[in-house]
Interface confidence: low
């Protein structure tokens, strides 16, 4: 299969015969890489290209979310003949090139992982010397970030008919299960869960009616650990008050 393409920037006629793998563009990435929040992860990406002895200027790029259009998280450029790819962009300073693009390796290290890093990443290389060519992985590599639960918000809010309700929001991956306990609730009450408020790792559980003063505890648990937070409800002379207390337990 032969393709002929006019490069509009250089107005060069490129003809390429697809014969052996060494003479074609391809990118090799794993389907998924898994790592824990707070740790580092390596996103492997190697490529082949048809320009056998290319040593001109090149740019290595990683983007997140969507191929071709997603925001860049890392970019570096290597001058003609140079083995050093000078970093031009590293989002929050947490992305570092591990591979050598001159050796067809764009592998990237991501430091200090957060749950927000859990998304798909796409590697891209651009040649910009005598040859003008570029290639980007279409499917990319999914970075799966795991994390023990963390309760990020617990609060008491006015409810209907002068009652009160409690809300507990936690994050974690796998998404944690939430349970309330407290006065006259017994252990592990049937809280009303409402998952995914704006982010796939967030889980919210509501306790619709707090009928007694005292300590109400929200527990979040997944396979990696559990976290607890409490809110104290007390009412006097028609007013009310609340205070909170957090406990985190991680399984290692």
């Amino acid at each position: 299969f032969v393709r002929t393409k006019i490069d509009t920037t250089e107005n060069l006629l490129n003809t390429e015969v697809h014969s052996s793998p060494a003479q074609r563009w391809s990118m090799q990435v794993p389907a998924e890489v898994s790592a824990a929040a707070g740790d580092a992860a390596v996103l492997p990406c190697t490529f082949t290209h048809p320009h056998r002895h290319y040593d001109g200027p090149l740019t290595a790029i990683w983007r997140a979310g969507e191929p071709y259009a997603g925001p860049q998280v890392f970019r570096c450029a290597a001058a003609r003949g140079s083995e050093l790819c000078q970093t031009a962009l590293s989002l929050h300073g947490r992305f570092r090139l591990l591979g050598n693009p001159r050796r067809n390796d764009l592998s990237l290290r991501v430091e200090r992982l957060a749950l927000a890093d859990d998304r798909r990443y796409f590697c891209r290389v651009e040649f910009a010397g005598d040859v003008h060519d570029r290639y980007e992985s279409r499917h990319g590599v999914r970075l799966h970030v795991t994390a023990a639960p963390r309760i990020i918000n617990i609060s008491v809010l006015p409810g209907p008919a002068h009652a009160f309700r409690a809300l507990c929001t936690a994050e974690g991956e796998p998404p944690p299960a939430l349970a309330w306990s407290g006065p006259a609730l017994g252990n592990g009450s049937a809280a009303v869960p409402s998952s995914g408020q704006g982010h796939g790792h967030l889980v919210t559980a509501e306790l619709p009616a707090l009928n007694h003063d005292g300590r109400y505890t929200c527990t979040a648990a997944n396979s990696l650990g559990r976290s607890e937070a409490s809110v104290y409800l007390f009412r006097f002379h028609g007013a009310s008050g609340a205070s909170t207390h957090h406990h985190h337990h991680h399984h290692h």
């Epitope: 390429e16 697809h18 391809s26 279409r138």
Partner: antibody, heavy 122, light 106 residues
């Protein structure tokens, strides 16, 4: 030369399953994606999903999740698609196609099989 | 998903005439791809990355466009061009096709 040979026509009952094959020849099977496309008269072409035999990674059109399962056997350079829970809406010609790159990192289905006709009827 | 709408659904032309068919995307795409299909045959890749002809496609065919509007033009139609032409996008999943434009030669 590159060839994709698909299995023969199928006449199946509603509620049953069917598996069709797509045997690749003339290129390195593990270097390219294989895409599957559904064609019903009056409905144009519909992408079902694709599979990369080299990294055993599949991509499915959400519409066909639970309906289509894509697999590949690298030893025989054959891709398979299984359709389950068949209804009359699944009556169609199903094509496999090799997915090749172009210079911009986008893709094109450059070689197509001859198609497998599936008729769902009681 | 990105919906591709092709028009006209049916074109009728005499040999030597110029014909243009369009493909409109519901949201912007980087490139458009075109396939030709004749009755009883599989689709064939015809134009890739908006304007590039695949090997063996006659030079009377051309593709153009950007954003949400793309077109395929045949400068001088020949009898062998009678077929259905489908546009397709690889911009975002699910990859989608247009409903097709069928070209008849009078």
């Amino acid at each position: 030369q590159v060839q994709l040979q698909q299995s023969g026509a199928e006449l199946v009952r509603p509620g049953t399953s069917v598996q069709m094959s797509c045997k690749a020849a003339g290129y390195t099977f593990t270097n390219y994606w294989i895409g599957w496309v559904k064609q019903r008269p009056g409905h144009g072409l519909e992408w079902v999903g694709d599979i990369h035999p080299g990294i055993n990674y599949t991509n499915n059109n959400e519409k066909f999740r639970g309906k289509a399962t894509l697999t590949a056997d690298t030893s025989s350079s054959t891709a398979y698609m299984q359709l389950r829970g068949l209804t009359s809406d699944d009556s169609a010609i199903y094509y496999c196609a090799r997915v090749d790159y172009d210079y911009d990192g986008s893709y094109i289905m450059d070689y197509w099989g001859q198609g497998t006709s599936v008729t769902v009827s009681s | 998903q990105i919906i591709l709408s092709q028009s006209p659904a049916l074109l009728s032309a005499s040999p030597g005439e110029k014909v243009t068919m369009t493909c409109r995307a519901s949201s912007s795409v980087s490139y458009m791809y075109w396939y030709q299909q004749k009755p009883g045959s599989s689709p064939k890749p015809w134009i890739y990355a908006t304007s590039n002809l695949t090997s063996g496609v006659p030079a009377r065919f051309s593709g153009s466009g950007s954003g949400t509007s793309y077109s395929l033009t045949i400068s001088r139609v020949e009898a062998e061009d009678a077929a259905t032409y489908f546009c397709q996008q690889w911009n975002s999943k699910p990859w989608t096709f247009g409903g097709g434009s069928r070209l008849e030669i009078r």
